[in-house]
Each structure stands twice: as structure tokens, then as C-alpha cells.
């Protein structure tokens, strides 16, 4: 048999080998496609099937506009002028080239050593589904699940049967200072069909910058608490990846597991003192917050003591 590839919506003519070019002809076309459950023999006189497959005067079969449901097998059996039976067999596959793929929501820049979403490549209106591939500086990117992660999604339109593909690329650049170029391409996987490429995007990779500032938040505000009360200290830091946070009281490290939150339940006078947190970032070393003062008093009507949380009484200290 012969393999035929036809574009969706385009006409297709299949010739019936051995059939005389003009009547009288002895021929039979039958098909087994998405429109049939078994073999359907077409009437030479024509009929309701003519809208999808019509026998032409020369014995060929015309598919006026091929669709997904027309994929399948077409066979003609003809008797030539010498009385010999000749058979033709076609395997028909259809395809649709989608619109040019696009990278949506592209990143503006990348940060070294951390996961960065580069963007999402979208292709709409393909058949069969095809594949999306990412390229870095013109070379094919092979996802390894660690430094290069690709999340794919394929959807099929309920009416047209055409596919929409989405591919989200996340990378962990190893070093800053570079300007990698990313692009995405769609391939149907058909012979003699070139891939469709997106416009490339060039991104700057920066080193992870120092944290913009550490905020030490204290609850209750002002750091004044009655005996038996609870104090919560939170070290808020805007850095990726989140750094390790250790705690210092009165200049000495507290022997606690690293945590951005320090909880002091049922405080007593022994918990009074000056607290600060230290954030340790892999590429920038330690960074200490401004201190806050915790005081345990019987009455909560005293103003904040010298060296306690700033005069605003907001319970927040920020390092610009």
C-alpha cells in the first residue's frame, strides 16, 4: 500500500490503478476511516457520502476537504481493459500545521544558582499533536529534571480535534554575567516538514544579590511582655533561596536549630535581653538584623525602654 499525507481542509485525489479513464468502468472503492466502523463500499452512482468521498468520472476518488475523521484506509479494485483485476491501497494520514509558536510570560532576567522560570512556549492548532523543544544558544536543551526542568501540557479542542501544546521551561543557571538565548520550536514529526521556531529571547543572568534587608518583627509590639506571656520574633528576609537564620541573645548565639521564627513561650525575667537574627546566604555570608529589646514587666503601661524597638512602636526594624 501507499502512505499518503494530506493537509486538513485540502482536497485529496486517490487514483484507481488499472481503471479505464472513461466509463464503462468496473471498479469498487471502499474505505475504512473514522467515519466508518468497518468497510464502507461507495456507490458508483454517488450518494450522501459524496460530500466526503466522491468517485470521479475517471475512476479516481476525490476527498473534497480532508478531515481528521478521514484518516484510514482506502482501497480500489478495478478491472482493466484486458480483464485483469488491479488493486490500489492507500493509508491516509492528515496533518495541520499550527500557528507559529510563541513564548508567553518570558522572564526579564535570570538569577544564578536558583530555579528560574524562563517562559511558556505555546503552539495552537496542530494535528497530530507534535512536540515542542527548547533550545539554548541554538543547541537542543535536554531536560534533566534538575538544572533543566520542562513541564508539558497537551489539550485537544473538543470540536476541531486540533491540539494546543504548552511547555514551561525552568532552569538553574550556574553562573552570573552570561546572556543566554532561549528559543522554542514546534515539530509535527512529518518528513520534509521543517520545525517552526519562536523568536529567541536573550536574558541576562545575575548573581544572587545580597538580601535587600532583614526585618525583625516582634510580637507583642514594643517587646514588652508580662511574665508567663509569649513573645514571637520573626526574621523576615527577601532573598532566594531563603537563607539559614540563627538567633543571637545579648551577643551570644542561641543553641537552636536554624529557623526564621523564634518563639519564647511563658517568658520570665531570664528571657529579657537584646535579640537579633543572623541570615547566612550561600554566596554572601552572614547578615545581622538590628537588635530588639525584650522586657518582662508586671504592668504593661511603661513606655518602651532605651534600646528597645524604635520610637514608632510598630514593632518592626528594617535595614535599608
Amino acid at each position: 500500500g501507499q502512505n499518503i499525507t494530506a493537509r486538513i481542509g485540502e482536497p485529496l485525489v486517490l487514483s484507481c490503478k488499472g481503471a479505464p479513464k472513461k466509463p464503462p468502468q468496473q471498479l469498487e472503492w471502499k474505505l475504512n476511516t473514522g467515519r466508518t466502523e468497518a468497510w464502507k463500499v461507495l456507490s458508483p452512482q454517488g450518494g450522501p457520502w459524496d460530500s466526503v468521498a466522491r468517485i470521479l468520472p475517471n475512476g479516481s476518488l476525490l476527498l473534497p476537504a480532508t478531515g481528521i475523521v478521514d484518516e484510514g484506509t482506502f482501497r480500489c479494485r478495478a478491472t482493466n481493459r484486458r480483464g485483469k483485476e488491479v488493486k490500489s491501497n492507500y493509508r491516509v494520514r492528515v496533518y495541520q500545521i499550527p500557528g507559529k509558536p510563541e513564548i508567553v510570560d518570558p522572564a526579564s532576567e535570570l538569577t544564578a544558582s536558583v530555579p528560574n522560570k524562563v517562559g511558556t512556549c505555546v503552539s495552537e492548532g496542530s494535528y497530530p499533536a507534535g512536540t515542542l523543544s527548547w533550545h539554548l544558544d541554538g543547541k537542543l536543551l535536554i531536560p534533566d529534571g534538575k538544572e533543566t526542568l520542562v513541564k508539558e501540557e497537551t489539550r485537544r479542542h473538543p470540536e476541531t480535534g486540533l491540539f494546543t501544546l504548552r511547555s514551561e521551561l525552568t532552569v538553574i543557571p550556574t553562573q552570573g554575567g552570561t546572556h543566554p538565548t532561549f528559543s522554542c520550536s514546534f515539530s509535527l514529526g512529518l518528513p520534509r516538514r521543517r520545525p517552526l521556531n519562536t523568536a529567541p529571547i536573550q536574558l541576562r543572568v545575575r548573581e544572587p544579590g545580597p538580601p535587600e534587608g532583614i526585618q525583625l518583627l516582634v510580637e507583642p509590639e514594643g517587646g514588652i511582655v508580662a511574665p508567663g506571656g509569649t513573645v514571637t520574633l520573626t526574621c523576615a528576609i527577601s532573598a532566594q533561596p531563603p537563607p539559614q537564620v540563627h538567633w543571637i541573645k545579648d551577643g551570644a548565639p542561641l543553641p537552636l536549630a536554624p529557623s526564621p521564627v523564634l518563639l519564647l513561650p511563658e517568658v520570665g525575667h531570664e528571657d529579657e535581653g537584646t535579640y537579633s537574627c543572623v541570615a547566612t546566604h550561600p554566596s554572601h555570608g552572614p547578615q545581622e538584623s538590628p537588635p530588639v529589646s525584650i522586657r518582662v514587666t508586671e504592668t504593661g503601661d511603661e513606655g518602651p525602654a532605651e534600646g528597645s524597638v524604635g520610637e514608632s512602636g510598630l514593632g518592626t526594624l528594617a535595614l535599608a
Partner: antibody, heavy 119, light 107 residues
């Protein structure tokens, strides 16, 4: 909204001729096959003629072949049935219907026009 | 030519009844069968297309099924507005053939 409106029915003598029209609106007329179906008084439905969307191919049952001609004017969104050599048994309500091929069957029908063949 | 043998030709039923109408094709017509409802003095209205698919705007109490060359229209719970005549149609081959019709009357 799809609308099919038939006209041209009436009383005609046996052997006479009549031309029915069907005005279509609310859809892209030249995308569809069109069909005439008839119903004799108190009887069932009978297929009369079909035409493909281009108008190049027409189809009839033996009962009307060589007497009836279906045609269409895609520019005017109109379907026609030319009926010649009319017989008493052609008396029926004639319906215009959208479709007639395997993709549609008949999905929309007009309200019909009555043709009476009698002397 | 294909014959579509529809049965019964008439039936009496009450509101709420389950009603089944059958058409048998004399040869394989695939899925290419429609069902229509017709009320006196009105044009037919398509209920089911391609044997099993409910047409737009048709209540879900109507359903179509197929077993080989046997096609069935079922009304799960008959409503007062369902008293009418029902026809099947094969549109797989010319001449296109309708069943003889089934008149559903009030018991």
C-alpha cells in the same frame, strides 16, 4: 437563527408544472447540501431530491427522476424545485431541509408548502 | 434500496411512561440514522443525529441507541408535549429512506 421559508405551492392540473422556492437565512448557505422532502396527506415522509453545496451534483429517487429538477442559487441563498409532468400522487406538503449528506442528515426544516395535483 | 422498518406504527402511553420506538435497517447503515418528531400541521424536528447524539435544545429524556442495524429512540418519562409522530431516517445511501412513523397517543 436558521430559517427556511418555502413558497410556490398551489393547485395544478395533472401533467402541469410548478416551481417551488426555499429562501434560506441565518447560516452560510453554500456550506450545506440542501434537500426537498414531501409528505402526502396523512402519510409518512419521502425524500424527493438533494443537491450538494456547489450545485454541481444532484440526486433523486426513481419516483421523481427525469420529472423533477433541484437547483440552487448560492448568491441569493435560495433553493428551487422544478416539478414537471405532475401526477396526482405528487400531491403533498413539500419541505425544504438543510443537509442530506452524511455530515448532517437533515437538521433544519422549513414549514412546508402544499402542492395539490388535481383536475 | 434500504428499507427502514419502524415499529410499532402506533402506541398508547401515559404521562411518565417510558416509551421505546425501534427502526430496523435492511442492511448496514453505520451510524447514519436520525430521529425526528412531528406534530400535526408542523414541520419535523430533529431529535437525535447519527444514531445516538442529542440535537441542540432537545430535552435529555430523549435518547438514541444502536445495536448493529437496529436503532432505538427512547423517551425515559413521557411528557404531555411528547404526544406526536416519530420518524427515523437513514442517510447512508440513496435513496434516503424514512421509517413509516410511530404515532404516540395518550392512553
Amino acid at each position: 437563527e436558521v430559517q427556511l421559508v418555502e413558497s410556490g405551492g398551489g393547485l395544478v392540473q395533472p401533467g402541469g408544472s410548478l416551481r417551488l422556492s426555499c429562501a434560506a437565512s441565518g447560516f452560510t448557505f453554500n456550506n450545506y447540501w440542501m434537500t426537498w422532502v414531501r409528505q402526502a396527506p396523512g402519510k409518512g415522509l419521502e425524500w424527493v431530491a438533494s443537491i450538494d453545496n456547489s450545485g454541481d451534483n444532484t440526486y433523486y429517487p426513481d419516483s421523481v427522476k427525469d420529472r423533477f429538477t433541484i437547483s440552487r442559487d448560492n448568491a441569493k441563498n435560495s433553493l428551487y424545485l422544478q416539478m414537471n409532468s405532475l401526477r396526482a400522487e405528487d400531491t403533498a406538503v413539500y419541505y425544504c431541509a438543510r443537509g442530506g449528506d452524511i455530515t448532517t442528515g437533515f437538521d433544519y426544516w422549513g414549514q412546508g408548502t402544499l402542492v395539490t395535483v388535481s383536475s | 434500496d434500504i428499507q427502514m422498518t419502524q415499529s410499532p406504527s402506533s402506541l398508547s402511553a401515559s404521562v411518565g411512561d417510558r416509551v421505546t420506538i425501534t427502526c430496523r435497517a435492511s442492511q448496514d447503515v453505520g451510524i447514519y440514522v436520525n430521529w425526528f418528531q412531528q406534530k400535526p400541521g408542523k414541520a419535523p424536528r430533529r431529535l437525535i443525529y447519527r444514531a445516538t447524539n442529542l440535537a441542540d435544545g432537545v430535552p435529555s429524556r430523549f435518547s438514541g441507541s444502536r445495536s448493529g442495524t437496529d436503532f432505538t429512540l427512547t423517551i425515559s418519562s413521557l411528557q404531555p408535549e411528547d404526544f406526536a409522530t416519530y420518524y427515523c431516517l437513514e442517510f447512508d445511501e440513496h435513496p434516503l429512506t424514512f421509517g413509516g412513523g410511530t404515532k404516540v397517543e395518550i392512553k
